[in-house]
Amino acid sequence: TLNSVLNSNAIKNLPPPLGGAAGHPGSAVSAAPGILYPGGNKYQTIDNYQPYPCAEDEECGTDEYCASPTRGGDAGVQICLACRKRRKRCMRHAMCCPGNYCKNGICVSSDQNHFRGEIEETITESFGNDHSTLDGYSRRTTLSSKMYHTKGQEGSVCLRSSDCASGLCCARHFWSKICKPVLKEGQVCTKHRRKGSHGLEIFQRCYCGEGLSCRIQKDHHQASNSSRLHTCQRH
């Protein structure tokens, strides 16, 4: 078996959720239901169990964030909650749905100068007055040797997109997160669906570049839902 498939190093890997298998059924093109992941020392299957306990946003799907389920609720119990749509209230970027970010407490549409919600994590921010640790899982803000003085080039390990050079975003790539190219016109993109086909987001693509959006490829309209190919297309 692969050793330490997902360890708890923040810049490289997602930490395992409390008492469960590593990874989380996020909504990604890399959905692979029922695959086996090491949870502790033995393999177990990952099902779409709800609610999903979490310690930080990066353990949740790309259209979810980690928080206490009730306002002023027990700070020691956090679960993955559905992201907030545009114009909804927020306290940090991760609360907003892909393509939006949190500005002045409201989710607003991203532009080229801001975070892209489908990739970014805000590991260093805590949720309101909640504690920044949960049963031993800290938010790990110390990155020691992995803090860079220069912007990361394609393929280098990163924590967030601001670590990467222009034209790159920080996206998960199996064992870690690395700087990947922002997608160009015609390239395959990942359209995140709100429900169903949840898989482990161990592989992410960047978002489409400026003036492009991720849409079903014209000649794939007749294909079955599962095999529809999305590509970056002009607005």
């Epitope: 992995k146 394609e154 390990v157």
Partner: antibody
Framework: EVQLVQSGAEVKKPGESLKISCKVS????????IGWVRQMPGKGLDWMGI????????RYSPSFQGQVTISADKSISTAYLQWSSLKASDTAMYYC?????????WGQGTLVTVSS | QSVLTQPPSVSGAPGQRVTISCTGS?????????VHWYQQLPRTAPKLLIY???NRPSGVPDRFSDSKSGTSASLAITGLQAEDEADYYC??????????FGGGTKLTVL
């Protein structure tokens, strides 16, 4: 210029130990993963495992788990592949490669011959 | 036996177009994971040819292109040249977090 320079060819006997190296230059050693790939004579490529030199986090292919050890020394920007007890079937060319989005830079290879 | 299946050999005359297929399954290529292509010239280390989402490293001519559909991927080489004679390997990832290679395809330029 990114370069991965591997140690020279080795001829060993079964049961002997061996450690081959891959010296990296031209980029920050601790910002990319380094992988090892085996190519047996006349055969294809087999992924052995990968290491993140920043903290020595290592992943192995199930086929090579327990058979080899991958390590790295940050102070000299060098990755290693080692065997504690070689077998004749370990005879192969071994490549180190930088893992970016793909294996974007490769070493020249180290030929390991194990024969009694 | 490789997880990704490639034809052992393909051939073509100079100037022609050849394609090399790479067939996987729902736990690798079909899961949406990237497919990369490498060229290995005789007695040399492999070289990255195409990576990820149809990206070519600098120096790789646009005669080389790739495509992906379902659980398969393919590499196309147009305007075949004598120096293209080499072994070609596809590479992807498996849901078990393993790197997987195809068995390789020997391209002969007639």
């Amino acid at each position: 210029e990114v370069q991965l320079v591997q140690s020279g060819a080795e001829v060993k006997k079964p049961g002997e130990s061996l450690k081959i190296s891959c010296k990296v230059s031209g980029y920050s050693f601790t910002t990319y993963w380094i992988g090892w790939v085996r190519q047996m004579p006349g055969k294809g490529l087999d992924w052995m495992g990968i290491i993140y030199p920043g903290d020595s986090d290592t992943r192995y292919s199930p086929s090579f788990q327990g058979q080899v050890t991958i390590s790295a020394d940050k102070s000299i920007s060098t990755a290693y592949l080692q065997w504690s007890s070689l077998k004749a079937s370990d005879t192969a060319m071994y490549y180190c490669a930088r893992q970016g989005i793909a294996f974007d830079y490769w070493g020249q290879g180290t030929l390991v011959t194990v024969s009694s | 036996q490789s997880v990704l299946t490639q034809p052992p050999s393909v051939s073509g005359a100079p100037g022609q177009r050849v394609t090399i297929s790479c067939t996987g399954s729902s736990s690798n290529i079909g899961a949406g994971y990237d497919v990369h292509w490498y060229q290995q010239l005789p007695r040399t280390a492999p070289k990255l040819l195409i990576y990820g989402n149809s990206n070519r490293p600098s120096g790789v001519p646009d005669r080389f292109s790739d495509s992906k559909s379902g659980t398969s991927a393919s590499l196309a080489i147009t305007g075949l040249q004598a120096e293209d004679e080499a072994d070609y390997y596809c590479q992807s990832y498996d849901s078990s977090l393993s790197v997987i290679f195809g068995g390789g395809t020997k391209l002969t330029v007639l």
